[in-house]
């Protein structure tokens, strides 16, 4: 039975031209995390493999940086970066856990972080 939960940074906003850290945390399970995939809608942004390290998709290499931890840093944000982001935790033996983050990139200088929430 899958007992884990993923906590994410939830709904967040950031300034155009700035950067943002996408973070997820898997808790309440003893399952081994073998890989974390970061996706934007249907596009793979990056992979963090527990054994080998990070792979950043070539089309995002200039604007995506690994970490901190299993998180992902998006840089030089544009309004086109607004949308849903998913952290997909591949675990053994539980299977796959998915967390969702919604990022809004604002033209203005006021960008506030949303509340944290959990996805079972």
């Amino acid at each position: 039975m899958m007992t884990g939960t993923i906590e994410t940074t939830g709904n967040i906003s950031a300034e155009k031209g700035g950067s943002i850290i996408l973070q997820c945390h898997l808790s309440s399970t003893t399952a081994q995390v073998t890989q974390v995939n970061w996706e934007q809608q249907d596009q793979l942004l990056a992979i963090c493999n527990a054994d080998l390290g990070w792979h950043i998709s070539p089309s995002f290499k200039d604007r995506v940086a690994p970490g901190p931890g299993l998180g992902l840093t998006l840089q030089s944000l544009t309004v086109n970066d607004t949308g849903e982001y998913f952290c997909i935790y591949h675990t053994y033996p539980d299977g796959t856990y998915t967390g969702r983050i919604f990022l809004e990139v604002l033209e203005s200088s006021v960008a506030e972080h949303g509340a944290r929430f959990q996805i079972p």
């Epitope: 493999n49 527990a50 054994d51 080998l52 390290g53 990070w54 690994p66 033996p93």
Partner: antibody, heavy 117, light 107 residues
């Protein structure tokens, strides 16, 4: 005691194929990712590829991508490396190595692959 | 790919000497750095993982330090069985890459 034992090396002509095996014992094979690492005669170490323990996804070095395929049979505690379209520059000792936390913590003794006409 | 550069490529030392080998990464790898020892005709053996953690069964005369792009392996008092080639390896960005090796020879 953790043990990895490679087999299947030998002399093959350019363009030929070879399948290497790596038999594992002394640990729960299905819990660990495993990599192949090679070493050309008198040269340094080069990572070849990796296979995940449970889902079976793989990664490869650019130098072998599309020519080499890694697979595993957890019921037999065995790892495989299928090598096709072999080139002279693939000549090396091939090691299987258990992956753990970013390092390769246990290695086999290696098997020599010679690609020559 | 991340380039790993070791120095020196070779060194001569005597039993009892303190030996330090350095490894530089072409970009930050945080602390995802491992060190291996290889003797002629044998498979490599893991000595240090995550820059400074000693692998099971490895003598405490081996130590590692560093983070970011600069790392060192130190053998506090060289023993006869330590004459070998040493490799660093990064595990921060796929593909994993190794340094070219440092051969430690008897003076």
């Amino acid at each position: 005691e953790v043990q990895l034992l490679e087999s299947g090396g030998g002399l093959v002509q350019p363009g030929g194929s070879l399948r290497l095996s790596c038999a594992a014992s002394g640990f729960t094979f299905s819990n660990y990712g495993v990599s192949w690492v090679r070493q050309a005669p008198g040269k340094g170490l080069e990572w070849v590829g990796y296979i995940n323990p449970s889902r079976g996804y793989t990664y490869y070095a650019d130098s072998v991508k599309g020519r080499f395929t890694i697979s595993r049979d957890n019921s037999k505690n065995t790892l495989y490396l299928q090598m096709n379209s072999l080139r002279a520059e693939d000549t090396a000792v091939y090691y299987c190595a258990r992956s753990y936390g970013g390092g390769f913590d246990y290695w086999g003794q290696g098997t020599l692959v010679t690609v020559s006409s | 790919d991340i380039q790993m550069t070791q120095s020196p490529s070779s060194l001569s030392a005597s039993v009892g000497d303190r030996v330090t080998i350095t490894c530089r990464a072409s970009q930050t790898i945080e602390r995802r750095l491992n060190w291996y020892q290889q003797k002629p005709g044998k498979a490599p053996k893991l000595l240090i993982y995550d820059a400074s953690s000693l692998h099971t069964g490895v003598s405490s005369r081996f130590s590692g330090s560093g983070s970011g792009t600069y790392f060192t392996l130190t053998i506090s008092s060289l023993q006869a069985e330590d004459f070998a080639t040493y490799y660093c390896q990064q595990s921060y960005i796929i593909p994993p890459t190794f340094g070219q090796g440092t051969k430690v020879e008897i003076k």
